[in-house]
């Protein structure tokens, strides 16, 4: 079991020309809210199909009224996260739909009117228990920036929230037959189940059915904080009579922690809890770790919790860059051969092949002439994925089965008459024309534009075209 969490960072006009008009006006003030729908797997289902993993609706955002003449800014957002609880294992791959809705607050008949402003959808891989993944999606002229993560509800852990964990009994190893929950965590896989209702935050068990409390908590289920109400101050030497601490000067006075770090006292000195992106004794050093959620587009962050730790982003298909921030135009590498059409589906590349070619990259040339015969002495010619017959003289058609009519194309010019002949065609020219196709006029004085006709033929006689 666990929770999918979605944090909307901004919703406003995207970059580039054609900024959208503000969805709210002085006459119709409005506010935004968001809906998220989750489905398992990398399905390309319709928006209307059931949200099998769950759905959630945000609270309504602050009321917004457009300032006349001002371009549409980033619109005010609702507070808090959208949380989608899941009861079973986290599937690892999922599809999401995030809808931005506008609630108009003008004098609407029958209460407020709702309209869908934008809908974005995507398919991602995401391991539960990882850091926030950041994303930017565009819908028309609008741009939505958001982060998301899946976290397990204790005591479940692991990338699918299917394993149970408990603190290690010894710092270096787990008990017999128990694996570490994760190499970078000091916890062991726990097949045992604590007493029903035992607080997952403040209780633990060494044996099945028990509930032992962490320091500061008490009660049968470790849900009752140890009372310190009679103590005025949590600092200074202990008073023997009350068991309470008496004030004294503390190492956190004046807050030695830089960059917004918070100070807490330790028996010997102080400790700074640093905000994201800072580390060091006094939070004086800046650095990025997986806790800062540096990986975009569903990239998986790998790295230790220590601020000195490196991190790398394991990118899903279609993204690259040290933070998976760049979308790869994988079709620009022209992976499809033989004129195939490249389709980048995000999770995979597809090649749509031209006729006569096949294979994942259209690399296989199908033998168009295999098993095909051209009749009447024709020869088969491959080309462009379709077979073609080059026919012997006097034959035509796809397979050279048709006897060709050489006169069908009216080859004799200037009214000459065409006669089919075993070796081709013969043109009988009209008076005044000569040539194999009657293409040359005979000059009025009887001289031809061509050399003299061969012996035995006079101008006007049928000319055989061989």
């Amino acid at each position: 079991a666990g929770v999918f969490e979605l944090q909307i960072h901004s919703f406003g006009p995207g970059p580039g020309p054609g900024a959208p008009r503000s969805p709210c006006s002085a006459r119709l003030p409005c506010r935004l809210f968001f809906r998220v729908c989750l489905k398992p797997g990398l399905s390309e289902e319709a928006a209307e199909s059931p949200c099998a993993l769950g759905a959630a609706l945000s609270a309504r955002g602050p009321v917004y009224t457009e300032q006349p003449g001002a371009p549409a800014p980033d619109l005010p957002l609702p507070d808090g996260l959208l949380q989608v609880p899941f009861r079973d294992a986290w599937p690892g791959t999922f599809s999401f739909i995030i809808e931005t809705w506008r609630e108009e607050l003008g004098d609407q008949i029958g209460g407020p009117a709702w309209s869908l402003l934008a809908r974005v959808a995507g398919r991602r891989r995401l391991a539960a228990g990882g850091p926030w993944a950041r994303d930017i999606q565009r819908a028309g002229a609008w741009e939505l920036r958001f982060s998301y993560r899946a976290r397990c509800e204790p005591p479940a852990v692991g990338t699918a929230c299917t394993r149970l964990c408990r603190p290690r009994s010894a710092p270096s190893r787990c008990g017999p037959g128990l694996r570490p929950c994760a190499p970078l965590e000091d916890e062991c896989e726990a097949p045992l189940v604590c007493r029903a209702g035992c607080s997952p935050e403040h209780g633990f068990c060494e044996q099945p059915g028990e509930c032992r409390c962490l320091e500061g908590w008490t009660g049968p289920l470790c849900t009752v904080p140890v009372s310190t109400s009679s103590c005025l101050s949590p600092r200074g030497p202990s008073s023997a009579t009350t068991g309470c601490l008496v004030p004294g000067p503390g190492p956190c006075d004046g807050n030695p922690c830089a960059n917004g770090g918070s100070c807490s006292e330790t028996p010997r000195s102080f400790e700074c809890t640093c905000p994201r992106g800072f580390y060091g004794l006094r939070c004086e050093v800046s650095g990025v770790t997986c806790a800062d959620g540096p990986c975009f587009n569903g990239g998986l962050c790998v790295g230790g919790a220590d601020p000195d730790s490196a991190y790398i982003c394991h990118c899903p298909p279609g993204f690259q860059g040290s933070n998976c921030e760049k979308r790869v135009d994988r079709c620009s590498l022209q992976p499809c051969r033989n004129g195939g059409l490249c389709l980048d589906l995000g999770h995979a590349l597809r090649c749509r092949c031209r006729a006569g070619f096949a294979g994942p990259r259209c690399e296989h040339d199908l033998d168009d002439c295999a098993g095909r015969a051209c009749a009447n002495g024709g020869t088969c010619v491959e080309g462009g994925g379709a077979h073609r017959c080059s026919c012997a003289l006097g034959f035509g058609g796809r397979d050279c089965r048709e006897r060709a009519d050489p006169c069908a194309a009216r080859p004799c010019a200037h009214g000459g008459r065409c006669y089919a002949h075993f070796s081709g065609l013969v043109c009988a020219c009209a008076p005044g024309y000569m040539g194999a196709r009657c293409e040359f006029p005979v000059h009025p004085d009887g001289a031809s534009a061509l050399p003299a006709a061969p012996p035995g033929l006079r101008p006007g006689d049928p000319q055989r075209y061989l």
Partner: nanobody, 115 residues
């Protein structure tokens, strides 16, 4: 279960160099993110250097300029060249690989830096 095997650890003086190797292993392929994780006594495991599945490299602040990670996809092997070693580099170094579904670890090789 396929496992990663590290080699090249040992004892070295401050300022010295070592080259760690991991593999060959069918796990170390270009579609996986790989790296070197170290754990000093009493400390958390941390990623010292890594190469992502899209070829980006990153290093822990404390080793930048001194350590170099590389992979040979043809040999299915991962390397870590360590130079200008310091006492604080003393740790068990683990080879690590992962994709979206799985992560893989070696048994670790001990690097000790002492005068």
């Amino acid at each position: 279960e396929v496992q990663l095997v590290e080699s090249g650890g040992g004892e070295v003086q401050p300022g010295g160099s070592l080259r760690l190797s991991c593999g060959p292993s069918e796990i170390i392929t270009s579609d996986k993110s790989v790296g070197w994780v170290r754990q000093a006594p009493g400390k958390q495991r941390n990623l010292v250097a890594g190469i992502s599945n899209v070829g980006s490299t990153n290093y822990a602040q404390s080793v930048k300029g001194r350590f170099t990670i590389s992979r040979d996809n043809a040999k299915n092997t991962l390397y870590l060249q360590m130079s200008s070693l310091r006492a604080e580099d003393t740790a068990v170094y683990y080879c690590y690989a992962r994709d979206f579904e799985n992560e893989y670890w070696g048994q670790g090789t001990l690097v000790t830096v002492k005068p």
